[in-house]
């Protein structure tokens, strides 16, 4: 055991000592040469039994964030928030557990995905699947009728998701939402232009928001003869069809469902059209479809909603599309999904979609399901999938091998010579307390070319150096690390300087 | 048993030349680090030179650069030292020693050593 | 090169008595430092490693201490067989350096 412990400290000693001879840029020799030395006390350390059988890694489904992709997503957090603040918002947070009670019979076919938590004193909870449900439980509990309101945080699902494409068991939702009785469409293309200034922000790439109403979807499934029992089923089949062919989900839909081949085809006539307001023209003279009067009501509403697109300047984002079927149960009226797209191979083929970035819609029987007395709160939003956004951010980055600042850090206090850490300490100390974001080396004497050095790998625009000659000078040597040119400024300019060369306003408000 | 033997030692004129040996058994002799430390009548020891398992890495005091060579023959466990243009300061009991955990710098089973002299 | 200077350069004590001998380097070699124990005519005995790493056979009464660039080895209660010569010596980068020694004379 104590042979094992001894390694264990060389293979720490040895490994130290070659991150300290590639920091030192020694000779390729000496580092392969120890580098080699370190591989074979690591091989003599072999598995440590009492660890084998634990791999050391995140659970299923879940990742860490480096400083990196903490970089990426605040970037990514950042437009999402301002966008949502620009249209008004508050911000509220709920528990990441909810009473297992509040999510059942929510979520349809997708409550196998809900975690479930082990008896907790009784209550039996389950972590949220979404921020929706606990929203609507927020309205209802505090007797809200009227809010506008996002909502930033973690969600859970027990899927069995494919990481590389940004799809992840714990994963953040940004929300948007806003409940109360309105006039008809008017929240809900604020949501649609959000969606869209959102995406357009980000530069993520080109994107589409198919639009569709549930009231036309149950009409259409009434009009073809589908069984009112069957109307979700057959809605998380239709839903497939961005992904497979209309043959692999007609074979679900007769082979698994039930559903009679005919009336199968009936519904491959419709949910196989998109298109534009004029659909909407064409579905509104449909014989049939506008007989039936949730249709009818749900194709009004788009008609209506396609004019004020118009009129945020995005109805050119904006397809309408009968394959739109999102699975949860909830939503009642207008629903939405932007995808983004990849470009065609050849001309004339249709954009092809790889995935969806957000999505949302009109829910508003959900506050009434919690009200003892089932008083409705009409409510619609959206929510951002900022997960395969960060992956699709972090991707162009690589590519692009952009270096991503991980601080904030404007200046490095430094020092010229020696025994000056005290003169370092009350600087920097000024510093931070003029609100200027500081840094200096935890080093009594460091030499000025590892602090330079220091600034350029973390990207430090500005050294603040130190020197005997300029504290009785009583300036301060302001060196910028790209141009390297260097400036006397007087110690009491040295903030303001500071802030006008990163941009920062000159007082704290 | 695990152990290092040397050998070659002797009475040598200034100038002249002597090829040390040491030789090894009780343990897989490829798989260590090997050196050669000295140690003057009298003195404290100094470390003279190493070489690597696979031959790869060699190193030398700046006292015997140039006129000392190490090598190694693992097929027969035995580690040598030729010493060409001797000086009188080049007098001291030589000793093999292999590398704790086969690549730390530290001698954790020496030989016995062998005599040096170094005279006119 | 790394200097390596021991002191005292030589201790008097008896059986039973602890014992510290000081190892200094001329800069920080983290724990890069062993200790050996050498007796006339004899080849020099690794106590030490990695400055507190007891070596496989030694005994539990010699124990190391130190990292940077000060160091001890301590002999908690000496037994007639400890007295000789101690030498330290650098592991963190060649040419690989030994203290001058420290003699551990019987009083």
């Known amino acids: 055991m104590a042979e094992r412990a001894a390694l264990e400290e060389l293979v720490k000693l040895q490994g130290e000592r070659v991150r300290g001879l590639k920091q030192q840029k020694a000779s390729a020799e000496l580092i392969e040469e120890e580098v080699a030395k370190l591989l074979k006390l690591k091989a003599q350390l072999g598995p440590d039994e009492s660890k084998q059988k634990f791999v050391l890694k995140t659970p299923k489904g879940t990742r860490d964030y480096s400083p990196r992709q903490m970089a990426v997503r605040e970037k990514v957090f950042d437009v999402i928030i301002r966008c949502f603040k620009r249209h008004g918002a508050e911000v509220i947070d709920t528990p990441v557990f909810e009473l297992k009670e509040t999510l059942m019979g929510k979520y349809g076919e997708d409550s196998k995905l809900i975690y479930d938590l082990k008896d907790q004193g009784g209550e039996l909870l389950s972590l949220r699947y979404d921020l929706t449900v606990p929203f609507a439980r927020y309205l209802a509990m505090n007797k809200l009728t009227n809010i506008k309101r996002y909502h930033i945080a973690k969600v859970y699902r027990r899927d069995n998701p494919a990481m590389t494409r940004g799809r992840y068991r714990e994963f953040y939702q940004c929300d948007f939402d806003i409940a109360g009785n309105f006039d008809p469409m008017i929240p809900d293309a604020e949501c649609l232009k959000i969606m869209c200034e959102i995406l357009s922000s980000l530069q993520i790439g080109d994107f589409l928001v198919k639009v569709n109403d549930r009231r036309i979807l149950d009409g259409m499934f009434a009009i073809c003869g589908v069984s009112d029992s069957k109307f979700r089923t057959i809605c998380s089949s239709v839903d497939k069809l961005d992904k497979v062919s209309w043959e692999e989900v007609k074979n679900e839909m007769v082979g698994e469902k039930g559903l009679a081949p005919e009336v199968a085809d009936r519904i491959g006539d419709y949910v196989q059209q998109h298109g534009g307001v004029s659909l909407v023209e064409q579905l509104l003279q449909d014989p049939k479809l506008s007989q039936n009067k949730q249709a009818l009501e749900g194709l009004g509403d788009l008609k209506l909603l396609f004019e004020y697109l118009t009129l945020f300047g995005i109805d050119d984002k904006i397809s309408f599309d009968l394959s739109l079927a999102r699975g949860l149960d909830y939503y009642t009226g207008v629903i939405y999904e932007a995808v983004l797209l990849q470009t065609p191979a050849q001309a004339g083929e249709e954009p092809l979609g790889v995935g969806s970035v957000a999505a949302g819609g009109r829910y508003d029987g959900l506050v009434g399901m919690f009200d003892p007395k089932g008083r409705k709160v009409p409510c619609v939003g959206l929510s951002i999938g900022v997960e395969r956004i960060f992956s699709i951010v972090e991707q162009r980055l690589e590519a692009l091998e952009e270096k991503i600042r991980t601080t904030e850090t404007q200046v490095l206090v430094a020092s010229a010579q020696k025994k000056l850490l005290e003169e370092r300490l009350k600087l920097v100390s000024e510093l931070w307390d003029a609100g200027i974001k500081a840094e200096l080396l935890y080093k009594k004497n460091p030499k000025l070319l590892n602090q330079l050095q220091y600034c350029e790998e973390a990207g430090i625009p500005l050294v603040a150096i130190i020197g005997e000659q300029e504290l009785k000078d009583g300036v301060i040597k302001l060196r910028s690390v790209t141009s390297r040119e260097e400036v006397d400024v007087r110690r009491e300019d040295l903030v303001e300087e500071i802030k006008r060369r990163t941009g920062q306003p000159l007082c704290i408000c | 048993q695990v152990q290092l033997v040397e050998s070659g030692g002797g009475l040598v004129k200034p100038g002249g030349s002597l090829r040390l040996s040491c030789a090894a058994s009780?343990?897989?002799?490829?798989?260590?680090?090997m050196t050669w430390i000295r140690q003057a009548p009298g003195k404290g020891l100094e470390w003279v030179s190493y070489?690597?398992?696979?031959?790869?890495?060699?190193n030398y005091a700046d006292s015997v650069k140039g006129r000392f060579t190490i090598s190694r023959d693992n097929a027969k466990n035995s580690l040598y030292l030729q010493m060409n243009s001797l000086r009188d300061e080049d007098t001291a009991v030589y000793f093999c020693?292999?590398?704790?955990?086969?690549?730390?710098?530290?001698?954790?089973?020496w030989g016995q050593g062998t005599l040096v002299t170094v005279s006119s | 090169d790394i200097q390596m200077t021991q002191s005292p350069s030589s201790v008097s004590a008896s059986v039973g008595d602890r014992v510290t001998i000081t190892c200094r380097a001329s800069?920080?070699?983290?724990?890069?430092l062993a200790w050996y124990q050498q007796k006339p005519g004899r080849a020099p005995k690794l106590l030490i490693f990695?400055?507190?790493s007891l070596q496989s056979g030694v005994p539990s009464r010699f124990s190391g201490s130190g990292s940077g660039t000060h160091f001890t080895l301590t002999i908690s209660s000496l037994q007639p067989e400890d007295f000789a010569t101690y030498y330290c010596?650098?592991?963190?980068?060649?040419?690989?350096?030994f203290g001058q020694g420290t003699k551990l004379e019987i009083k």
């Open positions: 020693a292999r590398y704790v955990y086969q690549v730390v710098a530290i001698g954790d089973l």
């Open positions: 009780g343990f897989t002799f490829s798989d260590y680090y």
């Open positions: 070489i690597s398992g696979s031959f790869r890495y060699t």
């Open positions: 800069q920080g070699i983290s724990s890069w």
């Open positions: 990695a400055a507190s």
């Open positions: 010596q650098q592991a963190k980068s060649f040419p690989y350096t």
